[in-house]
Amino acid sequence: MALPTARPLLGSCGTPALGSLLFLLFSLGWVQPSRTLAGETGQEAAPLDGVLANPPNISSLSPRQLLGFPCAEVSGLSTERVRELAVALAQKNVKLSTEQLRCLAHRLSEPPEDLDALPLDLLLFLNPDAFSGPQACTRFFSRITKANVDLLPRGAPERQRLLPAALACWGVRGSLLSEADVRALGGLACDLPGRFVAESAEVLLPRLVSCPGPLDQDQQEAARAALQGGGPPYGPPSTWSVSTMDALRGLLPVLGQPIIRSIPQGIVAAWRQRSSRDPSWRQPERTILRPRFRREVEKTACPSGKKAREIDESLIFYKKWELEACVDAALLATQMDRVNAIPFTYEQLDVLKHKLDELYPQGYPESVIQHLGYLFLKMSPEDIRKWNVTSLETLKALLEVNKGHEMSPQVATLIDRFVKGRGQLDKDTLDTLTAFYPGYLCSLSPEELSSVPPSSIWAVRPQDLDTCDPRQLDVLYPKARLAFQNMNGSEYFVKIQSFLGGAPTEDLKALSQQNVSMDLATFMKLRTDAVLPLTVAEVQKLLGPHVEGLKAEERHRPVRDWILRQRQDDLDTLGLGLQGGIPNGYLVLDLSMQEALSGTPCLLGPGPVLTVLALLLASTLA
């Protein structure tokens, strides 16, 4: 049967896709008759010998037959058969290996709609990008929450792509999470980087307690800082009780000596005594709070002749305890500029940082901060929040250390402290920041962007706005308009072009009168709501010779939505073959709510239109 390709006119509001209908038929058994499921529960794999290739029905295979299927067999099946196999595996609760799951996922080329019918763990291997709409992604990640994420090692590419997609799906912006967010992430919460731990300690720490496997360094450092900071939910270590220690069970390995020393010793002793009687406690956690580094404690005195007179390369091979005992913190602070030149190991940098922390518990002075060099990479956002950085030179020196890397939570905190200290994002600062991080401007919230003075806009280059979303451009556009207001037409357009994603309809209409020849890339970034009211003639003038590019973009927003609003006759005047406009004799009712739900305007055919016209006529005559 040939399927109609024309857009249905009547009843086009929110009609389910034909694919869904076919799938409904399929799942009801109308397309492929289903058989009664075999009830065997054997655990051993039976030899397959091509049994998947041509059974009367895959669902008739026993769990024992399904258990051992090799990837090679699946490769030969059609997508339909693979889906049938996946459903059968789920129904019979067959436990699959990682390789089998990866193989099945690879063969399910189309994003499956029947997520509930598939083996839960199979979802971990599907590409989350295939479930991009809000409803699709919500369904996908609601299921993922119940899957065993730890089937995948932390470094596995399949696992690494899940977290960012889940955060986007649940609408998490920045690093602040609610309890509901953490719940929604399920096992993926264990992969949240340190910046989330720092910003959302209250809701995240209790979740991390139960994460299987160790936290990574970044998470450990953030958890340690949060616990040391004494905020909720656990409070200051000096107030912890035995029950707090119990609640912290899974996080005990991250406690550093400063935290352990702050816990009342009676509590530590009581807890240790109790946990040593409790066989359920795992060894590593019990040993955390035993008197630590006994061997090293005996060596705390600096061996004769090893006392550091200056910070130099002779310290490279000092053991951890020797650095601790033989390097004076005040000497280190005055000779910080030398640390950079010495190839210390990362472990040794930990010791040096610890020394500075003890010397400056309220935060480092700028004279030390300016010379931190690579030691800056060891600072946590908590450390940086204690600083008062006022010199642009200090900022540049620290950004230089992180050069070539993405903006880390440390850098973000540093910039935040610096900008807050200055009161606004002045031109020199913006110049510096965008030189190091072209995407910096787009990492700010609309509220933060509102403090950018129009004069600073001159420092912004087009590439600095590449990753800005419409809400950010809404804030920046009026500032740019103000900044460039004294320029003439063509020069003005060159400068304002990259900000136009925030322009309202009336400004676009004004631009269309100035022969600006906007390119398609810029047009595609315009706000949909600003483009929709433009007439065909206005768009033609706005784009000039680039109008021909509309054809290639007719399926994409905002072009698609704009076409739906135009009369087909008007579109035809462009001679581009654009289809989908309103046919003659049809009336567009702008049912905003309906359109918001279905994504397309509702079209009323000639019958209803005539009725509406008759009513309008009657009321006019009356």
Epitope: Q217, E313, F317, P343, T345, Y346, E347, L349
Partner: antibody, heavy 121, light 107 residues
Framework: EVQLVESGGGLVQPGGSLRLSCAAS????????MHWVRQAPGKGLEWVSS????????GYADSVKGRFTISRDNSKNTLYLQMNSLRAEDTAVYYC??????????????WGQGTLVTVSS | DIQMTQSPSSLSASVGDRVTITCRAS??????LNWYQQKPGKAPKLLIY???SLQSGVPSRFSGSGSGTDFTLTISSLQPEDFATYYC?????????FGQGTKVEIK
């Protein structure tokens, strides 16, 4: 082309001494930390010693401390390992290796072909 | 000293297979882990440094991941020249220590 060539290996009796050399070319020798790594027959790799800067700063594995001395002559682009009081367990292929330029990675990005030291009576 | 444990000690695979070798450190080493390849009678060759940075000249089928104590070397599609022994090495603290090696053999 960056290259390291070891020499000086051979058969020596327990308690004896040997001096290994490593000639470097193709890079600014004095700018890099240099290392000795060894591999006993059929076994894995073991870091032995490192030297930094002009040669005053050296580090050793506990298994060789007090018996081996690493040194360098930047004017000759040469690294040395003086091995005294040799034991049967020191039998291995000895590689000299250049430190990677990436800070803190302490990876060894260029290796010599190795020289075999056999300690046996 | 930090102990490095590789698994498996050896594995058999065919050309085109995806191969994964893991390395575990006895304590957290942040991301300071390097991987080497060694063929019989030859010196080791650096493949990956600092967990995931590919050494120049090394094919992109080699990749590394991990952090803290657990690390992975992956060869996405095994080639005939990849049959060798692979070593991990921690560079977080002196003394630098290596894993015992994983031998990748032809199936």
């Amino acid at each position: 082309e960056v290259q390291l060539v070891e020499s000086g290996g051979g058969l020596v009796q327990p308690g004896g001494s040997l001096r290994l050399s490593c000639a470097a070319s193709g890079f600014t020798f004095s700018d890099y930390g240099m290392h000795w790594v060894r591999q006993a027959p059929g076994k894995g790799l073991e870091w032995v010693s490192s030297i930094y800067g002009s040669g005053g700063h050296t580090g050793y594995a506990d298994s060789v401390k007090g018996r081996f001395t690493i040194s360098r002559d930047n004017s000759k682009n040469t690294l040395y390992l003086q091995m005294n009081s040799l034991r049967a367990e020191d039998t291995a292929v000895y590689y000299c290796a250049k430190q990677h330029a990436y800070r803190y990675s302490y990876a060894f990005d260029v290796w010599g072909q190795g020289t075999l030291v056999t300690v046996s009576s | 000293d930090i102990q490095m444990t590789q698994s498996p000690s050896s594995l058999s695979a065919s050309v085109g297979d995806r191969v994964t070798i893991t390395c575990r450190a006895s304590q957290s080493i942040s991301n300071w882990l390097n991987w080497y390849q060694q063929k019989p009678g030859k010196a080791p060759k650096l493949l990956i440094y600092a967990t995931s940075s590919l050494q120049s000249g090394v094919p992109s089928r080699f990749s590394g991941s991990g952090s803290g104590t657990d690390f992975t070397l992956t060869i996405s599609s095994l080639q005939p020249e990849d049959f060798a022994t692979y070593y991990c090495q921690q560079s977080y603290s002196f003394p630098f220590t290596f894993g015992q090696g994983t031998k990748v053999e032809i199936k």
